[in-house]
Interface confidence: medium
């Protein structure tokens, strides 16, 4: 297999990701990655219902900040729903604070998928009514 | 427009090292993962080596393992490859390509012309 | 490392024809696949990624399918700019690689 090398800890790992580790600033059962907590769902929900989920934990629906955080999301979960959406396939997609997203979203041509997700590296539409897995995220 | 330009190819003997450079422009460098991939004359591609956005990432081919090192610069623009211990068989065209979220590899460079022979 | 075999390996068709490309994994790599055409002396250029999305500004008559270890890449009715090499790749895991190449020339 290929070597990835680590800066964080000048270690060489076999695996794709960082190690996520259980530090004392984040709630029992979350994990912590680069100064930001995240609540990993175990049930499947709607977006919506995610959305709300998330809100009564105190934290946001999860939203991908750069690239690196995705590599190390999509290895936890690869399939769970971001706080990205688009009100109609005729508007643009946006964050859950109201930032135009700016990167690729897979399957947008479908009208009826207005919920983004990840998925295999990346980002893919998908129904809002669907049920997937959540997270949630909080920064500290 | 999106650019990856390629420099830093050349002759170098056996055992010889060469730094290969990629500038890129046209998108917000510092925000995408980095390729380089290669290809042997009338031959297939091989990918070599990749860096995530903020290099804490780095990933290389078994076949260059231990010989060549990647490296970024996002203050400059720039991607770097560290060629030691060259050998025949690294001889090749190698490409710096870029990754989007999720997606493979969207842009590519022109490609530099590295030759191992004494 | 996750090996992709492509075939056939070099294939002669005409203008209009139907083409059909196949690409298969050594284990299953979901739908992480990406298609590629490469002209000579040019850089390679993304035609489908993630097993059958058409890449922005690529021709209609491209189209990617398939899942886990089997996927084809289809040109539905070839134009004379199609005459070239194509790899597909899998981006599931670390070593990333490519198939052997398929060359498609003209009859």
């Known amino acids: 297999p290929s070597t990835l090398t680590q800066k964080h800890n000048n270690s060489s790992l076999n695996t794709r990701t960082q190690k996520a580790c259980h530090c004392g600033h984040c709630p029992e059962e979350w994990i912590t990655y680069s100064n930001s907590c995240y609540y990993i769902g175990k049930e499947k929900r709607t977006w919506a219902e995610s959305l709300l989920a998330c809100t009564l934990k105190n934290s946001s629906l999860l939203s991908i900040d750069n690239e690196e955080e995705m590599k190390f999301l999509t290895a936890i979960s690869p399939s769970t729903w971001t706080g990205v959406f688009r009100d109609s396939s005729q508007h643009p997609w946006v964050t859950i604070n109201g930032l135009t997203f700016k990167h690729e979203i897979k399957d947008s041509d479908n009208a009826e998928h207005n919920c983004a997700m990840l998925h295999a590296r990346g980002l893919k539409s998908d129904r809002c009514g669907s049920s997937k897995i959540y997270h949630c995220k909080h920064k500290l | 427009e999106v650019q990856l330009v390629e420099s830093g190819g050349g002759l170098v003997k056996p055992g010889g090292s060469l730094r290969l450079s990629c500038a890129a422009s046209g998108f917000t460098f510092s925000s995408h993962s980095m390729n380089w991939v290669r290809q042997a004359p009338g031959k297939g591609l091989e990918w070599v080596s990749a860096?995530?956005?903020?290099?804490?990432?780095?990933y290389y081919a078994d076949s260059v393992k231990g010989r060549f090192t990647i490296s970024r610069d996002n203050a400059k623009n720039s991607l770097y490859l560290q060629m030691n211990s060259l050998r025949a068989e690294d001889t090749a065209v190698y490409y710096c390509?870029?990754?989007?979220?999720?997606?493979?590899?969207?842009?590519w460079g022109q490609g530099t012309l590295v030759t191992v022979s004494s | 490392a996750i090996q992709l075999t492509q075939s056939p390996s070099s294939l002669s068709a005409s203008v209009g024809d139907r083409v059909t490309i196949t690409c298969r994994a050594s284990?299953?790599?979901?739908?992480?696949l990406a298609w590629y055409q490469q002209k000579p002396g040019k850089a390679p250029k993304l035609l489908i990624y993630?097993?059958?999305s058409l890449k922005s500004g690529v021709p209609s008559r491209f189209s990617g399918s398939g899942s886990g270890t089997d996927f084809t890449l289809t040109i539905s009715s070839l134009q004379p700019e199609d005459f070239a090499t194509y790899y597909c790749?899998?981006?599931?895991?670390?070593?990333?690689?490519f198939g052997q190449g398929t060359r498609l020339e003209i009859k």
């Open positions: 860096i995530s956005s903020s290099s804490s990432y780095i």
């Open positions: 284990q299953g790599i979901q739908s992480a």
């Open positions: 390509a870029r990754e989007e979220w999720g997606l493979p590899f969207d842009y």
């Open positions: 993630d097993a059958s």
């Open positions: 790749q899998q981006f599931n895991s670390y070593p990333l690689t």
